[in-house]
């Protein structure tokens, strides 16, 4: 995840990123909206790996928890919002079927705007 | 990827998302900064899967290609920038070693700011 601060830039929304294992995630939502169990171990070619996910979300302790940085407040209301993406993970569904499914994970913190009415 | 427009909201930066196969991706950058070849198919317990990645980047045709939406232009310069995250993929390195590595993929479009000097 590139760091704009290194280039003397500021993000409109502050985010935090961390690696999350299946042991901590436990469940996730798949593409059909169903809740699945995320398996801790992934059998790979002659071995096993721990499932890790790189997750990014809005920083609840950050400056931008009250709204986005740098917004024209005369015209806009703003909010930093965590967005999600899909990654493939080894999972088990409610019927105990194990398989590779795309699950939703937190992946970014973006700014959304609503226009100010009745000024 | 949630759609703010559904809630009567606008994004500060316009993005586009698409599914990308390893066949289209071909190479990627791993966590150590090395270029690796992304293998098209992954062996799984009952056959093989095509490697797919869900990628999101700034929309080059969007309104926000000249700068972010809703920014206070008196105080800030702005730019929409594609950010990256990590996903695990079956890859081959320059020494022909095949293994699961974390690679960088485009995952979001965020707004970065620089303060306007000498107004």
């Amino acid at each position: 995840h590139s760091d704009p601060a290194r280039r003397g830039e500021l993000s409109v929304c502050d985010s935090i990123s961390e690696w999350v294992t299946a042991a901590d995630k436990k469940t996730a939502v798949d593409m059909s909206g169903g809740t699945v169990t995320v398996l801790e171990k992934v059998p790979v070619s002659k071995g096993q790996l721990k499932q890790y996910f790189y997750e990014t979300k809005c920083n609840p302790m950050g400056y931008t928890k009250e709204g986005c940085r740098g917004i024209d407040k005369r015209h806009w209301n703003s909010q930093c919002r965590t967005t999600q993406s899909y990654v493939r993970a080894l999972t088990m569904d409610s019927k105990k079927r194990i398989g590779w499914r795309f699950i939703r994970i937190d992946t970014s913190c973006v700014c959304t705007l609503t226009i100010k009415r009745g000024r | 990827h949630s759609d703010p427009a559904r809630r009567g909201e606008l994004s500060v930066c316009d993005s586009i998302s698409e599914w990308v196969t390893a066949a289209d991706k071909k190479t990627a950058v791993d966590m150590s900064g090395g270029t690796v070849t992304v293998l098209e198919k992954v062996p799984v317990s009952k056959g093989q899967l095509k490697q797919y990645f869900y990628e999101t980047k700034c929309n080059p045709m969007g309104y926000t290609k000249e700068g972010c939406r809703g920014i206070d232009k008196r105080h800030w310069n702005s730019q929409c920038r594609t950010t990256q995250s990590y996903v695990r993929a079956l890859t081959m390195d320059s020494k022909k070693r095949i293994g699961w590595r974390f690679i960088r993929i485009d995952t979001s479009c965020v707004c970065t700011l620089t303060i306007k000097r000498g107004r």
Epitope: W19, V20, T21, A23, D24, K26, K46, G47, K50 | G99
Partner: antibody, heavy 118, light 108 residues
Framework: DVQLVESGGGVVRPGESLRLSCAAS????????MNWVRQAPGKGLEWVSG????????DYADSVKGRFTISRDNSKNTLYLQMNSLRAEDTAIYYC???????????WGLGTLVTVSS | EIVLTQSPGTLSLSPGERATLSCRAS??????LAWYQQKPGQAPRLLIY???TRATGIPARFSGSGSGTEFTLTISSLQSEDFAVYYC??????????FGGGTKVEIK
């Protein structure tokens, strides 16, 4: 720079308890599995226990299962090992080790010595 | 549990000589093997992972090879700071993560 500093070692009698701590700095502590590895005097390395980044998953060597408990406090960037019902064979230097995403150890502390003797 | 057997137990060599250390696994572990160096009174230090990839900052004189059950750590030309104990570790099947018994490289 990554730093791991263990503390809490000492001399105890068989059957007694001890709590080890490992203060971590220089990396996003909550992102990584952390482990305890021990080394009996003049012997090799033995993996003892591991815990996932947010504490949801724990593993133990059979030799300590039921007696030792691994835990972490991410707000303090600290790893713990609660050791109960200690035995003479638990005498060792206990190292705290950071696990990589691929399950080997890229950083180790200097260790803390635990001596169990009557 | 996968057992790793290291040989020889002790290797007596002179500076400038080539050191060849062996690690044998009780069952195939693909390339899921790491090597560590430990000097007296110090913590272990990661040298090699995935059987042959050097860790950050490790000199090119250290190299790893092997796959399956037979692995080798080679130090092409021993420097004074290389005299230490070397351990292999498997991460193919866990828990438990297991280490070899170690090989001591001493000055002849």
């Amino acid at each position: 720079d990554v730093q791991l500093v263990e503390s809490g070692g000492g001399v105890v009698r068989p059957g007694e308890s001890l709590r080890l701590s490992c203060a971590a700095s220089g990396f996003t502590f909550s992102s990584f599995y952390m482990n305890w590895v021990r080394q009996a005097p003049g012997k090799g390395l033995e993996w003892v226990s591991g815990i996932s980044g947010r504490g949801g998953g724990t593993d133990y060597a059979d030799s300590v299962k039921g007696r030792f408990t691994i835990s972490r406090d991410n707000s303090k960037n600290t790893l713990y090992l609660q050791m109960n019902s200690l035995r003479a064979e638990d005498t060792a230097i206990y190292y705290c080790a950071k696990e990589t995403l691929n399950i080997f150890f890229d950083y180790w502390g200097l260790g803390t010595l635990v001596t169990v003797s009557s | 549990e996968i057992v790793l057997t290291q040989s020889p137990g002790t290797l007596s060599l002179s500076p400038g000589e080539r050191a060849t250390l062996s690690c044998r696994a009780s069952q195939p572990i693909n390339r899921y093997l790491a090597w560590y160096q430990q000097k007296p009174g110090q913590a272990p230090r990661l040298l090699i992972y995935d059987a042959s990839t050097r860790a950050t900052g490790i000199p090119a004189r250290f190299s790893g090879s092997g796959s399956g059950t037979e692995f080798t750590l080679t130090i092409s030309s021993l420097q004074s700071e290389d005299f230490a104990v070397y351990y292999c570790q498997q991460y193919y099947d866990w828990p438990p993560l297991t280490f070899g018994g170690g090989t001591k490289v001493e000055i002849k």
